[in-house]
């Protein structure tokens, strides 16, 4: 092909030419195209005009080219380049004009480039860039050039892994004349060890990221100081996984940031078995939103019932034990992947609408009620992945929920009584792989508004399907694959008048039956994969509904005999349905094994078996 | 509105078992919060002796834990404490109460005088 | 388990004046501390909850405040219906405990 040896990805839009041993810009690729990568390809220098033949370039990656040098208006005629992508090329040689003509450009990439300083980086003119990344570079001080005020769409500033030491006054005096309130800024990993105080004054961030920049304790709470009269939408502080410079916290370590006004605040990688953490945080009680993540902790007990965090996440974090957790204003918990508390004890959120409390190998005495969430206003419930739930409440107060998520999760008392009678709005159950064995037949009634139902690996008594889903009239996608079924009541499926996909995968079926689907006018999906399916229960196979669209029979054992001659032929009608047809193998008689069954003329000259 | 009533005999002999019930109107036991017993003897403060929940766990004051028990009947919507090995200590107004998601006591019975004597 | 020390355990008051009792843990509870009104021969109310919290119905001459490990209750101007004995209970671990009250008379 003309383009080759590059790939094309999109026609005539999106071609990779990476490490390709390219010592010049290929002329055989399409003057269309829009994505163009060339990455580890030893360019090493671009010369003027360098993309003249691309005039519709929108992305351009370069890394590693071993580019040294780059010369005036080598960018020149990409007036539509919005990504601009030059990670780890060294170079040494960058024209005043070097990005000229990028009239479009919204990110540029200059990661590991030898940039010892932004004073001399020529982007001024580049007034649409949102995002600039020069990390990993040499930039040792934090002066932000005069050019900074005609980047006023600037966005993102990522600054991280550079050798800045000391952030002055005078550095960010340009802030003052713009009001890049928008503007997101990471110094993360670079070594900080004076901020001097005021610098940040009247400064609104968006975003600021300060993460494993500190060699000890000290130096981090004269920092924090010196951020003083800083508003921030959003900070994150704290250390990496593999650059863990800090010893334990001490409850005077963020005192510093009462003089910050924060909206979300993001601890993480840190160690902090203090006995009282209220001391800790109390400059934090009004922000919005408050997340811990991968911090080792003692207890939040003491956390106050008065902070005002509307969104609280604790993620990936070290208990002794369950945290006592009540908050007044809180409306949503994400508690997920943390170790140590074994047992879920309950909290006091009078506002909460979003519970996620997955990944925590819980054990719950007692689920569902109001009282052990202390609300009544919750919509959103995931409790998967936990230990024991044992199922003793019917959700008594939780009328609210829309969305429920138990998926691996060990349900206890699930066939004792209609355990999710009261939960009129709910429009999503997940209870997947949750050891429910069915035996009781109004295990889903009160279910008005479901539209999702997903309860594969789970079993029946008996093997059987019963009519357990009669009050299920709003379902639109049933998930009843793994659940050991090799038989099913006819009437199963009859209220489900606007249920759209069906997976029956990975049961026990060894014939398939349309009756059950007589009553499925919306039926678009049905998927029979992976069964035992051999021929059909009956010689009178009718019509699936005329809404179906895709129907799956692979990995199935079907019995290509001449009594089954019927049965195959059907299949064969069936043909624009079937997905993946050519999976569909006979599995007897054995000259006949793995022979693809729409291939098989079934004239019944077979061999008689 | 949720209401307790506690019942049971006024007076227990010395080493013999205090038995005594909680009755509940207006919640079921079986939907939620837990259900506990709380004791005053007369002219002293409130002593808490344990909680049965809606699950039907159950959990003691580590003082009383080798002599309480703390059950339920559903089916009658009541609770019911028993304390063995009884003394003149154990002297006092039994009330039952529900705790809320919060560890405090917003429903109270009005409390039932029990005295141990011979 | 936690202790909680009230004082003073009686307090005589003549109306409209100001009472203040106050409630003090044996290790940091945080905000995790309730109050209630016990009058003679009845079960006590909760008055207060998470040391400043009015219950609703509660009148507003109620009021709290503290955190960690000092608390007050505080009534306004004291009406002769407010003789009762009050009690401090800590929520913040099992097993839940009581304050040993103050008792407030109507002078």
């Known amino acids: 092909e003309s383009w080759e040896p590059c790939v094309e990805v999109v026609p005539n839009i999106t071609y990779q030419c990476m490490e390709l041993k390219f010592y010049k810009i290929p002329d055989n690729i399409p003057f269309s195209t829009k994505n163009l990568d060339l990455s580890f390809n030893p360019l090493r220098h671009l010369g003027s005009y360098s993309f003249l033949r691309f005039p519709e370039l929108q992305v351009l990656d370069l890394s590693r080219c071993e580019i040294q040098t780059i010369e005036d208006g080598a960018y020149q005629s990409l007036s539509h380049l919005s990504t601009l992508i030059l990670t780890g090329n060294p170079i040494q040689s960058l024209a005043l004009g070097a990005f000229s003509g990028l009239s479009s450009l919204q990110k540029l990439v200059a990661v590991e480039t030898n940039l010892a300083s932004l004073e001399n980086f020529p982007i001024g003119h580049l007034k649409t860039l949102k995002e600039l990344n020069v990390a990993h570079n040499l930039i040792q001080s934090f002066k932000l050039p005069e050019y900074f005020s005609n980047l006023t769409n600037l966005e993102h500033l990522d600054l991280s892994s550079n050798k800045i030491q000391n952030i002055y006054c005078k550095d960010l005096q340009v802030l003052h004349q713009m009001p890049l309130s928008n503007l997101s800024l990471d110094l993360s990993l670079n070594p900080i060890n004076f901020i001097q105080p005021g610098a940040f004054k009247e400064i609104r961030l968006h975003k600021l990221t300060l993460r494993s920049n500190f060699d000890d304790l000290n130096v981090m709470k004269t920092c924090i100081q010196g951020l003083a009269g800083l508003e921030v939408h959003r900070l994150v502080l704290g250390e990496f996984r593999n650059e863990r410079n800090l010893e334990e916290f001490d409850k005077s370590s963020l005192e510093g940031l009462c003089n910050l006004t924060i909206e979300e605040f993001r601890l993480t990688y840190l160690d902090c078995y203090l006995d009282n953490i209220i001391d800790l945080f109390n400059c934090l009680a009004n922000v919005s939103s408050f997340s811990l993540v991968s911090v080792n902790i003692k207890r939040v007990e003491d956390f106050s019932y008065n902070f005002r965090w509307q969104h609280l996440e604790l993620v990936n974090c070290k208990f002794e034990q369950f945290p006592t957790l009540e908050l007044k204003s809180l409306k949503r918990l994400t508690f997920t992947a943390n170790k140590g508390g074994n047992a879920f004890s309950e909290v006091d959120l009078p506002s909460l609408e979003f519970l996620d409390l997955s990944r925590n190998g819980l054990s719950f005495k007692g689920c569902c009620s109001q009282s052990d969430f202390g609300t009544t206003s919750l919509k959103y419930l995931d409790l998967s992945f936990n230990d024991v739930i044992t199922m003793s409440s019917n959700f008594l107060g939780l009328e609210q929920l829309e969305h429920l998520d138990f998926q691996h999760s060990n349900l206890k008392q699930m066939s004792q009584f209609s355990v999710f009678l009261s939960l009129r709005n709910l429009i999503y159950l997940d209870i997947s792989h949750t050891h429910t064995r069915v035996a009781f037949n109004g295990i889903f009634d009160g279910l008005l508004s479901l539209k999702v139902l997903k309860m594969a690996g789970n079993s029946f008594q008996e093997n059987f399907l019963p009519d357990i889903f009669t009050d299920l009239k709003n379902l639109t996608f049933l998930d009843l694959s793994q659940c050991q079924l090799e038989q099913l009541s006819p009437t199963a499926f009859d209220t489900l008048n606007k249920l759209q996909v069906l997976n029956m995968s990975h049961n026990n079926f060894f014939s398939l039956d349309t009756f059950p689907y007589k009553c499925l006018p919306s039926l678009q999906v049905l998927d029979y994969s992976l069964n035992h399916i051999m021929t059909s229960n009956n010689q009178e196979l009718q019509h699936f509904p005329s809404s179906l669209a895709f129907l799956n029979l692979t990995q199935n054992d079907f019995a290509c005999t001449c009594e089954h001659q019927s049965f195959l032929q059907w299949i064969k009608d069936q043909r624009q349905l079937l997905v993946e047809a050519e999976r569909m193998e006979c599995a007897t008689p054995s000259d006949k094994q793995g022979m693809p069954v729409l291939s098989l003329n079934i004239t019944c000259q077979m061999n008689k078996t | 509105q949720v209401q307790l009533q506690e019942s049971g005999p006024g007076l227990v002999k010395p080493s013999d078992t205090l038995s005594l019930t909680c009755a509940v109107s207006?919640?079921?036991?079986?939907?939620?919060?837990?259900w506990h017993w709380i004791r005053q003897p007369p002219g002293k403060g409130l002593e808490w002796m344990g909680y049965?929940?809606?699950?039907?766990?159950?959990d003691f004051n580590p003082s009383l834990k080798t002599r309480i028990t703390i059950s339920r009947d559903t089916s009658k919507n009541q609770f019911s404490l028993k304390l063995s090995s009884v003394t003149a200590v154990d002297t006092a107004v039994y009330y039952c109460a529900r705790k809320d998601s919060g560890n405090y006591f917003p429903y109270w019975g009005q409390g039932t005088l029990v005295t141990v004597s011979s | 388990e936690i202790v909680l020390t009230q004082s003073p355990d009686f307090q005589s008051v003549t109306p409209k004046e100001k009472v203040t009792i106050t409630c003090r843990a044996s290790q940091s509870i945080s905000d995790h501390l309730h109050w209630y009104q016990q009058k003679p021969d009845q079960s006590p109310k909760l008055l207060i909850k998470?040391?400043?919290h009015a219950i609703s119905g509660v009148p507003s001459r109620f009021s709290g405040s503290g955190s960690g490990t000092d608390f007050t209750l505080t009534i306004n101007s004291l009406e002769a219906e407010d003789a009762a004995t009050y009690y401090c209970?800590?929520?913040?671990?099992?097993?839940?405990?009581f304050g040993g009250g103050t008792k407030v008379e109507i002078k």
């Open positions: 998470y040391a400043s």
């Open positions: 207006g919640y079921p036991i079986w939907g939620g919060y837990s």
């Open positions: 209970q800590q929520g913040h671990s099992f097993p839940l405990t």
């Open positions: 049965i929940h809606y699950s039907g766990y159950t």
